[in-house]
């Protein structure tokens, strides 16, 4: 299923993030998904 | 599924020192933040010291009550957190939990174990 | 150091109650986007648990009658329908800055 608003997909970690955590680890895989 | 376990609390003398550790398993330890926050008997939660990642040098963090007595680190390869305290006081007699997050909210938490320090 | 002011710091409801439980950061926790706050529960010896993250975002697990809003300085944990294993102590936490703080607390008893 698709991750929810608010968060992307994280193929390092295999699950769904919250965009919000961001902020602090800009550099995240998932970050390139959130608005 | 996710597990924190601590160890390591006690009963010391002010003055004296200890060492907790935490061995984490369920999740990709190397990956995430780690924690201590602390709870004083019957009062409330006081975070301790942060430890991040490889990729951050490792940076440390500490509250102020603790800056310069207490030094957190870790080991990936043995998916483990310590906390090593020096110069202990009354003050610091505590419940310690150590907790892993990836940024921001406390995901996951251990048992806690128990630090008395008293003459 | 951002503090945190929770209140009331204990409380006592029925089964049933609709519980709010607000907490107030001496400064703004929040971006246009997102806010940093952190709900958890803790029951008497074990360990805190997270319920909410960013204000809002109910964590995996946790029943839906718990919500959480807010932005800025001020914020809400609501309790739709206090049930039995809901009595409990429910901490505020911020991850703006460090240091991380975490309010005083609110104890929920049995009325």
């Known amino acids: 299923a698709p991750c929810s608003r608010g968060s992307s997909w994280s193929a390092d970690l295999d699950k769904c993030m919250d965009c919000a955590s961001c902020r602090a680890r800009p550099h995240s895989d998932f970050c390139l998904g959130c608005a | 599924q996710v597990e924190l376990v601590e160890s390591g609390g006690g009963l010391v003398q002010p003055g004296g020192s200890l060492r907790l550790s935490c061995a984490a398993s369920g999740f990709t330890f190397s990956s995430y933040w780690m924690s201590w926050v602390r709870q004083a008997p019957g009062k409330g939660l006081e975070w301790v010291a942060e430890i991040r990642l490889k990729s951050d040098n490792y940076a440390t963090h500490y509250a102020e009550s603790v800056k310069g007595r207490f030094t957190i680190s870790r080991d990936d390869s043995k998916n483990s957190l310590y906390l090593q305290m020096n110069s202990l006081r009354a003050e610091d007699t505590a419940v310690y939990y150590c907790?892993?997050?990836?940024?921001?909210?406390?995901?996951?938490w251990g048992q806690g174990t128990l630090v008395t320090v008293s003459s | 150091d951002i503090q945190m002011t929770q209140s009331p710091s204990s409380l006592s409801a029925s089964v049933g109650d609709r519980v709010t439980i607000t907490c107030r950061a001496s400064?703004?926790?929040?971006?246009?986007?997102?806010?940093?706050m952190h709900w958890y529960q803790q029951k008497p010896g074990k360990a805190p648990k997270l319920l909410i993250k960013y204000a809002s975002n109910l964590e995996s697990g946790v029943p839906s009658r718990f919500s959480g809003s807010g932005s800025g300085t001020d914020f809400t944990l609501t309790i739709s329908s206090l049930q039995p294993e809901d009595f409990a102590t429910y901490y505020c936490q911020h991850s703006w800055e460090i240091p991380y703080t975490f309010g005083g607390g609110t104890k929920v008893e049995i009325k």
């Open positions: 907790t892993g997050y990836y940024a921001d909210a406390m995901d996951y």
């Open positions: 400064q703004s926790v929040s971006t246009s986007s997102y806010s940093y």
